[in-house]
Interface confidence: medium
């Protein structure tokens, strides 16, 4: 059923290549609605009737919500931001985060995707991520591929670069994590690695690109030399326990 | 190191076609994106088309969508660009870029030239 | 075309910082922490010199430094040298559909 779905939760924005270099392979974020079960490190947490979560930043709030200051006027004043629930479309927005999963902030308003450009929305992805042994029903992202996934990309568990529906498809030390528009095996991070933070149920909806979850023995950090002046720019990176 | 050749680049005339290759070494080219970045004389620089490691999916500017197609060969580390029905404002220096989340790497580019 | 926009020129003397803007909307730039800034000397390629905002490559000078606030992104160049001496492109995406999107560029120009 919809909601015993599993989902990889652990968001990147652009994993260090593993050659060394700037920049590097990315794919963009599966979140999952209150009630689904997601993938927190190798436990799996339920996330029904939570309480309003404080935050710093949209990333650490649910693909329904986005971090913002309870009462009306600047974000943060008066103390503690909290996630809040997503606009609906049509509604008044300042950022994509503050829209609702298949829409996006233009102009000041809350717009539907153009899914004819756009990859699937955060519920059809976890439809897609529950279709079991059908991996030609789920080669689509919203865009038509010019070849179809086969079962037989499943026989051996994906290296690094394959196209992957769960982090199951990937060899040891990968995590499945979007790119662009498809879903690829990536390196699970190492002490050190630039990471993403996502204290609960992974990343808002208009994440593009993914990182995988830090490696054991590791937690995604603030990187306590690093002050940025924006919060949506500190850096957090893998670091020991 | 990492390093990207671009070849294939001439003049050519409206309406005619040109293949463009890029020659990738020093990392694992069938784990990358990559993509295609133009620049024409004196201007700024357009992304063009990207391709998926796998080949399973490629996409492009609206600018060339139809007339253009990206392929790799993952096997000789190669990386394509099918040029068709080529128009004067399609006069640019073509460039291969490792595409991450940014275009980490690129080559050295290849002039394309559409004269009559 | 959609493109970020940039001054078309900036200039600044040996030492000096100087900072490049980058303005984009809502649905690209303003969007996104997926800003890159690129240097292009004339007649060579494009080098990566800032990812993910305020990211630096390795090998690239502590004197490049990015920041972003709200529908702008920024380069500053501190202590400014002859070599600096380049155009500049931003990048990020648009939302619908996804693609990657540049600045015009701005030239830099280091004076004396």
């Known amino acids: 059923t919809l909601n015993s779905v599993l989902i990889n939760s652990n968001a990147i924005k652009n994993l260090p290549p593993p050659l060394g270099g700037a920049g590097g392979q990315p794919g963009s974020a599966v979140s999952v609605a209150p009630g689904v079960l997601y993938e927190g490190g190798n436990k799996y947490q339920t996330l029904d009737n939570y309480q309003p979560y404080p935050c710093a930043e949209d990333e650490e709030c649910g693909s329904d919500e986005y971090c913002s200051s309870p009462s009306r006027g600047a974000a943060g004043v008066g103390g503690v931001q909290i996630c809040l629930a997503c606009r609906k479309r049509r509604k008044r927005c300042m950022r994509h985060a503050m829209c609702c999963p298949g829409n996006y902030c233009k102009n000041g308003i809350c717009m539907p995707s153009d899914h004819s450009h756009f990859p699937r929305g955060e519920i059809e992805e976890s439809i897609i991520e529950n279709l079991g042994n059908d991996h030609n029903a789920a080669a689509g992202d919203g865009y038509p591929r010019r070849t179809t996934l086969t079962s037989k990309i499943y026989h051996t568990k994906g290296q690094e670069g394959s196209v992957c529906l769960r982090s199951s498809d990937c060899a040891a030390g990968l995590c499945c994590a979007r790119h662009f528009w498809s879903k690829i095996c990536k390196p699970v991070l190492k002490e050190g690695q630039v990471c993403t933070k996502h204290k609960r149920k992974g990343s808002h909806g208009l994440e593009i690109f993914q990182r995988c979850y830090c490696g054991e023995g590791l937690a995604c950090r603030i990187q306590k030399d690093h002050h940025q002046a924006s919060n949506s720019s500190r850096l957090h990176t893998c670091q020991r326990h | 190191q990492v390093q990207l050749v671009e070849s294939g680049g001439g003049l050519v005339q409206p309406g005619g076609s040109l293949r463009l290759s890029c020659a990738a070494s020093?990392?694992?080219?069938?784990?990358?994106?990559m993509s295609w970045v133009r620049q024409a004389p004196g201007k700024g620089l357009e992304w063009v088309s990207v391709i998926s490691s796998d080949s399973s999916s490629t996409y492009y500017a609206d600018s060339v969508k139809g007339r253009f197609t990206i392929s790799r060969d993952n096997s000789k580390n190669t990386l394509y660009l099918q040029m068709n029905s080529l128009r004067a404002e399609d006069t640019a220096v073509y460039y291969c870029?490792?595409?991450?989340?940014?275009?980490?790497?690129w080559g050295q580019g290849t002039l394309v030239t559409v004269s009559s | 075309d959609i493109a970020l926009t940039q001054p078309a020129s900036v200039s600044g003397s040996p030492g000096q910082s100087i900072t490049i803007s980058c303005t984009g909307t809502?649905?690209?730039?303003?969007?996104?922490?997926?800003v890159s800034w690129y240097q292009q000397h004339p007649g060579k390629a494009p080098k990566l010199m800032i990812y993910d905002v305020n990211n630096r490559p390795s090998g690239v000078s502590n004197r490049f430094s990015g920041s972003k606030s709200g529908n702008t992104a920024s380069l500053t160049i501190s202590g400014l040298q002859a070599e600096d001496e380049a155009d500049y492109y931003c990048?990020?995406?648009?939302?619908?559909?996804?693609?990657?999107?540049f600045g015009g560029g701005t030239k830099l120009t280091v004076l004396g």
């Open positions: 990048q990020s995406y648009t939302y619908t559909p996804i693609s990657p999107v």
């Open positions: 870029a490792r595409h991450g989340i940014d275009f980490d790497h």
């Open positions: 809502s649905s690209d730039l303003g969007g996104y922490n997926y």
């Open positions: 020093g990392f694992t080219f069938s784990s990358y994106w």
